[in-house]
Interface confidence: medium
């Protein structure tokens, strides 16, 4: 079986003008999941990104995220990329007031 | 930095069992999961198992009947046991730490243990 | 199970010479999902190139890999010394997990 993951991103406000982007998969089975954020298309390197493991959610499915730090006012820059089960898709850092984004594929 | 330091026999009987004690330093094995990969001059480079952060448990299906893992996160420590050897057992085992992210591929190994099977 | 097919077994290279090692797969890979590591005698495996074409810390921007779907490879564009060392192709795309049989690269 298959069960593609809902896919959440978020902000949260640090100091000096930087932010942390959250992107967070759940819900999802298999276990094997690509997670990863993208500046302008681009993968951003390994040690600018913080992961969780990939751990049971409670429902026979899976979760799991991943997180970055950005300068404030770049966020239309970034997005978070998807790979599970040979469906993939970008998810937008959200803009304005607007702090959370969900979409399932 | 990131240490996976392994112990375990040398030389094991043909039906005996294997167990061999991976103690990790530089990461906590509450974050990141731990390989089993084993390298004989025949098979070549072979993943057995892994353990992930909450202490479940993948096996590769051909060891699986004879194959256990097991950790305990407050000791750093990662534990293989193996079942029924046979010569055909007989190459270095490894303990890898699982990367995280987007890859999942295996970042640092430890210096393995050496295993021979034999009467 | 994935069956993963490294040629040629043993490639000989003189210094300064361009090499390029290829890794099939027996069924479609997930780019993100293959990787290389090289491994010395007497040594561990360390990690190489991760998702096909993005190199672990500290390994020299000489070397670059490629591809996808059942077909990857590794190339070093100038090779030195300290390149001599089998290279194998791994793929973490489904359980269980396999290993190339490797690709021995030695000094001419």
């Known amino acids: 079986r298959t069960v593609p993951p809902m896919v959440n991103v978020t902000c949260s406000e640090v100091s000096e003008g930087n932010i942390t982007v959250t992107c967070r998969a759940s819900s999802f089975y298999p276990r094997n999941i690509t997670l990863t954020w993208r500046q302008d298309g681009v993968s951003l390197s390994h040690n600018t990104q913080q992961w969780g493991d990939v751990l049971p959610d409670g429902n026979g499915t899976y979760q799991t995220w991943v997180a970055t730090r950005i300068r404030q006012g770049e966020e239309q820059r970034f997005t978070c990329y998807m790979e599970h089960s040979g469906n993939h898709g970008t998810h937008p850092v959200p803009s304005g007031k607007v702090l959370a984004l969900q979409s399932q594929w | 930095q990131v240490q996976l330091k392994q112990s375990g026999p040398g030389l094991v009987q043909p039906s005996q069992s294997l167990s061999i004690t991976c103690i990790v330093s530089?990461?906590?094995?509450?974050?990141?999961?731990v390989h089993w990969v084993r390298q004989s001059p025949g098979k070549g480079l072979e993943w057995l198992g892994m353990?992930?952060?909450?202490?479940?448990?993948d096996y590769n299906a051909a060891f699986i009947s004879r194959l256990s893992i097991n950790k305990d996160n407050s000791k750093s420590q990662v534990f293989l046991k193996m079942n029924s050897l046979q010569a055909d057992d007989t190459g270095i085992y490894y303990c890898?730490?699982?990367?995280?992210?987007?890859?999942?591929?295996?970042?640092?190994w430890g210096q393995g243990t050496s295993v021979t099977v034999s009467s | 199970q994935i069956l993963l097919t490294q040629s040629p077994a043993i490639l000989s290279a003189s210094l300064g010479e361009r090499v390029t090692m290829t890794c099939t797969a027996s069924s479609s890979v997930s780019s993100s999902y293959l990787h290389w590591y090289q491994q010395k005698p007497g040594s561990s495996p360390k990690l190489w190139i991760y998702s096909t074409s993005n190199l672990a810390s500290g390994v020299p921007a000489r070397f670059s890999g490629g591809g996808s779907g059942t077909s990857y490879s590794l190339t070093v564009s100038n090779m030195e010394a300290e390149d001599a060392a089998t290279y194998y192709c791994h793929q973490y795309h489904r359980s269980p997990f396999t290993f190339g049989s490797g690709t021995k690269l030695e000094i001419k």
């Open positions: 530089g990461f906590s094995l509450t974050t990141y999961g």
């Open positions: 353990i992930w952060t909450d202490g479940t448990t």
């Open positions: 890898v730490r699982k990367g995280h992210g987007y890859y999942y591929a295996m970042d640092y």
